[in-house]
Interface confidence: low
């Protein structure tokens, strides 16, 4: 999906009002310095691409993020503010339902959500332009 035509300010508002708090809740009890940010993004469409990938694509050691509160709110925000996003997700959602596993908060998931926090931060403050 190409995130270029999303309403970035509306997505930012959704993040500030709720998603950020849900991410903090998920990470509660974890030191902010525990994980190094290894994933980054260079502009807002790129950030949303990385956010979608980390939030909704199961990875080795962390298959359970898609049903977390922050993930559901992320999905809702993208569906509302990114034209045509919902249609592209129908097949992916059906596939997810077939292989959904028991919800477990693993260290790998915590690390992945820490990366997500970094990506959202970058999304919310696009890089200063090089002069």
């Amino acid at each position: 999906y190409d995130f270029t035509n999303c309403d970035f300010e509306k997505i930012k508002a959704a993040y500030l009002s709720t998603i950020s708090k849900d991410l903090i809740t998920y990470m509660s009890g974890t030191k902010s310095t525990e994980f190094n940010n290894t994933v980054s993004c260079s502009n807002r469409p790129h950030c949303l691409t990385e956010i979608q990938s980390l939030t909704f694509n199961p990875t080795a050691g962390c298959a359970s993020l898609a049903k977390e509160m922050f993930a559901m709110k992320t999905k809702a925000a993208l569906a509302i503010w990114c034209p045509g996003y919902s249609e592209t997700q129908i097949n992916a959602t059906q596939a997810m339902k077939k292989r959904r596993k028991r919800k477990v908060t693993t260290n790998k998931c915590l690390e992945q959500v820490s990366q997500l926090q970094g990506l959202w931060r970058r999304f919310n403050r696009p890089l200063l332009k090089q002069q």
Epitope: S20, L128, K129, Q130
Partner: antibody, heavy 121, light 105 residues
Framework: EVQLVQSGAEVKKPGASVKVSCKAS????????MNWVRQAPGQRLEWMGI????????SYNQKFKGRVTLTVDKSASTAYMELSSLRSEDTAVYYC??????????????WGQGTTVTVSS | EIVLTQSPATLSLSPGERATLSCRAS?????MHWYQQKPGQAPRPWIY???NLASGVPARFSGSGSGTSYTLTISRLEPEDFAVYYC????????FGGGTKVEIK
């Protein structure tokens, strides 16, 4: 623990340049912005500019544009502020200040100890 | 450029009294931050994003406001609260107000 350690005091002559360093530790240097703020004796805080260590992007206070240059050395986790064409009014304490992204806004959450720059003939 | 005007420049009060510090912006801003500075020290973050107290800041401090008008309130002044307080915005550049000095009467 986040720490910003600045270089020592400098005495310069009018027309010269000064370069102040700010060594960061305790966090991922490229994750946050670095601001430079100065304070003349008995005066208000004055923002000079901001740099993103991630890509070297900068934004300057128009008052200093052309005279101030902000740079970073990512490998050394160090930010630099160079001020040229010094005049007596540039005598001040110069601070580096990390700008974190709190989920409700930007703020300068950690400050260096300050570097005193004295410009005198 | 957004100009921040703090008033009063100096506030002379006694311990136990209530202090109200004002910061007005020349145009609307999203948030206001506040910093405390004592003589010979670097500024310390005091209130983030209008109303969030920084770590270690006592609950007698509070922040409020929106648009162009923001306020820092100290409900009951303690001896350690006497200092200079600066407001700062991040919407357009990073500008500071002129500061309000809270001094012992």
């Amino acid at each position: 623990e986040v720490q910003l350690v600045q270089s020592g005091a400098e005495v310069k002559k009018p027309g010269a340049s000064v370069k102040v360093s700010c060594k960061a530790s305790g966090y991922t240097f490229t994750d946050d912005y670095m601001n430079w703020v100065r304070q003349a004796p008995g005066q208000r805080l004055e923002w000079m500019g901001i740099i993103s260590p991630y890509n070297g992007g900068t934004s300057y206070n128009q008052k200093f544009k052309g005279r101030v240059t902000l740079t970073v050395d990512k490998s050394a986790s160090t930010a630099y502020m160079e001020l040229s064409s010094l005049r007596s009014e540039d005598t001040a304490v110069y601070y580096c200040a990390r700008e974190d992204y709190d989920y409700d806004g930007y703020a300068m959450d950690y400050w260096g100890q300050g570097t005193t720059v004295t410009v005198s003939s | 450029e957004i100009v921040l005007t703090q008033s009063p420049a100096t506030l002379s009060l006694s311990p136990g009294e209530r202090a109200t510090l004002s910061c007005r912006a020349s145009s609307s801003v999203s948030y206001m931050h506040w910093y405390q500075q004592k003589p010979g020290q670097a500024p310390r973050p005091w209130i983030y994003a209008t109303s969030n107290l920084a770590s270690g800041v006592p609950a007698r401090f509070s922040g409020s406001g929106s648009g162009t008008s923001y306020t820092l309130t100290i409900s009951r002044l303690e001896p350690e609260d006497f200092a200079v307080y600066y407001c700062q915005q991040s919407d357009s550049g990073r500008e500071f107000g002129g500061g309000t000095k809270v001094e012992i009467k």
